[in-house]
Amino acid sequence: HTAAQDNCTCPTNKMTVCSPDGPGGRCQCRALGSGMAVDCSTLTSKCLLLKARMSAPKNARTLVRPSEHALVDNDGLYDPDCDPEGRFKARQCNQTSVCWCVNSVGVRRTDKGDLSLRCDELVRTHHILIDLRHRPTAGAFNHSDLDAELRRLFRERYRLHPKFVAAVHYEQPTIQIELRQNTSQKAAGDVDIGDAAYYFERDIKGESLFQGRGGLDLRVRGEPLQVERTLIYYLDEIPPKFSMKRLTA
C-alpha cells in the first residue's frame, strides 16, 4: 500500500494510523475503527471512512428531508459493516438487532426489519445528484467557468474520471453536479462516484479527509465559491423498496 515514505502518512485519508511495518519496511496505513489496510494512492471507501468516524465520539449532525424522487441520507451516522474490500455489506444491523438493506453508498433503501431480513445483493447507486446553493455574490458565475472548475476539482482532487461527471447545471444560486457510473462502466482502479461524492461532501462542510492539505478553496476565475447548503440525492440501479406508508408520509 503506497503512502508518503518520508514521514509515513496517508495523503488521501487522515483517519488512519500509519506505520513502517508493511512488507519490506514499507509504510502501511490502517483505517481507524476497522484496521483494514488502505491504498493511500486513491480515495478510501465511504464505508471505511464512516467506520473510522464512528470509532471516536462525534457530534450529531442535522439531516436533510428525504426526497420522494430519490434516496437521501436521512438516517444519519451509523457504524457500518464493511466487506473485506471496504464496501458496504448489503445488510446493516444495529446493536439492537434492527436490520435494513443499503445501497453502495450506505444509504438505507428498505424499511427496517429484524435479523430475518434478507438483502440479496448490494444494489449499486449509479446516479448521484449533488445540489448546492452558494452564498450571494456580486453577480452570477459564468456557467462554463463553473462547469470547468468543478470538473477539474473532481478530476484532480478526487481522482474521478471525467466521464463520470455527467453534467453541471447552474441557475443562480443553485448548482447541481450529476455523477453517473453504471456497474458496467466502472473499471478496476476507477474511483467510485459514491466515494468521490462523500469526500466532496466532507470538503464542503470544512471537514476535509485529506491529510495535511488545506481545506477546500473553491474559486471560479478568482471569485470564491462558498456553499451554504448541500443536498445529495442517490438513485439506485434497482428502485428502493419502501412500504407505501413511508412513500405517502
Epitope: 506505520s19 513502517p20 511495518d21 519490506g24 481507524l32 484496521g35 483494514m36 489496510a37 473485506p84
Partner: antibody, heavy 117, light 107 residues
Framework: EVQLVQSGAEVKKPGASVKVSCKAS????????INWVRQAPGQGLEWMGN????????NYNQKFKDRVTMTRDTSTSTVYMELSSLRSEDTAVYYC??????????WGQGTLVTVSS | EIVLTQSPATLSLSPGERATLSCRAS??????ISWYQQKPGQAPRLLIE???ESISGIPARFSGSGSGTDFTLTISSLEPEDFAVYYC?????????FGGGTKVEIK
C-alpha cells in the same frame, strides 16, 4: 537483536487489577505496533488489542474494551497492559508481541497472571 | 469479526510423514494470514506470513498456500521437533483473530 522482555508472574484477587509491562529493545520502538495476546491454560490464543507507540493510538478487542488499558512510555521503550475487574477466567499467560509485515514477528516470554481468592 | 476455523483439531502422524493443516476464514481476507508454531511453555513462533511467504530462519519444509477463505500449512516431512500446536491468524482487519489451533502429535 529484537527483544521483548515482560514483567514477572502475578497473583491477584478477583476484582483487582493487574498491570503487565513489556520492554522493547533492538528496534525503533515508536515505529511498530505492540499487540497483547493471552492464552488461558490449555486454550488457544486470544488477541486483546494493540497500541501504536508513536502516537499512543490504541485499539481494543470489544470483549475487553471496558476493562483493558494499554499505555506506553517512550523514554523507556515500554508498553503497559492493565486489566481491571479481574475474574478467575482471566487466569492466563499474557504475551506482548511486536507486529511487522502483517504478522506477530517477535514475542515476549509471557507473563502468568493467576486470579484466585 | 472474522472467524478462523482450523481443521483437524488433532493430527496424528509419524516422523517423515507429510502434514497438511487447514484454516478457513469466515470471509475473504485475501492473503492476510500468518501461521505460528507453539510448543508447551513457549511463546508462539512465526512460520509463514502473507499466506505463503516464508520467514527467515524457518526450515524450508514449512510452506503455506491459499487466498481468500481457504489456507493450508504444509510440513513436507515431519521432524521430531515439529510436533506442536499450530495456529493461523488473520490481520485483514481488527479485531485480529486466531484459529483454534491444530495439534500435531506423534502417532
Amino acid at each position: 537483536e529484537v527483544q521483548l522482555v515482560q514483567s514477572g508472574a502475578e497473583v491477584k484477587k478477583p476484582g483487582a487489577s493487574v498491570k503487565v509491562s513489556c520492554k522493547a529493545s533492538g528496534y525503533t520502538f515508536t515505529s511498530y505496533w505492540i499487540n497483547w495476546v493471552r492464552q488461558a491454560p490449555g486454550q488457544g490464543l486470544e488477541w486483546m488489542g494493540n497500541i501504536y507507540p508513536s502516537n499512543s493510538y490504541t485499539n481494543y478487542n470489544q470483549k475487553f474494551k471496558d476493562r483493558v488499558t494499554m499505555t506506553r512510555d517512550t523514554s523507556t521503550s515500554t508498553v503497559y497492559m492493565e486489566l481491571s475487574s479481574l475474574r478467575s477466567e482471566d487466569t492466563a499467560v499474557y504475551y506482548c508481541s511486536s507486529y511487522r509485515s502483517d504478522a506477530f514477528a517477535y514475542w515476549g516470554q509471557g507473563t502468568l497472571v493467576t486470579v484466585s481468592s | 469479526e472474522i472467524v478462523l476455523t482450523q481443521s483437524p483439531a488433532t493430527l496424528s502422524l509419524s516422523p517423515g510423514e507429510r502434514a497438511t493443516l487447514s484454516c478457513r476464514a469466515s470471509q475473504n481476507i485475501g492473503t492476510s494470514i500468518s501461521w505460528y508454531q507453539q510448543k508447551p511453555g513457549q511463546a508462539p513462533r512465526l512460520l509463514i506470513e502473507f499466506a505463503s511467504e516464508s520467514i527467515s530462519g524457518i526450515p524450508a519444509r514449512f510452506s503455506g498456500s491459499g487466498s481468500g477463505t481457504d489456507f493450508t500449512l504444509t510440513i513436507s516431512s515431519l521432524e521430531p521437533e515439529d510436533f506442536a500446536v499450530y495456529y493461523c491468524q488473520q490481520s485483514n482487519s481488527w479485531p485480529f483473530t486466531f484459529g483454534g489451533g491444530t495439534k500435531v502429535e506423534i502417532k
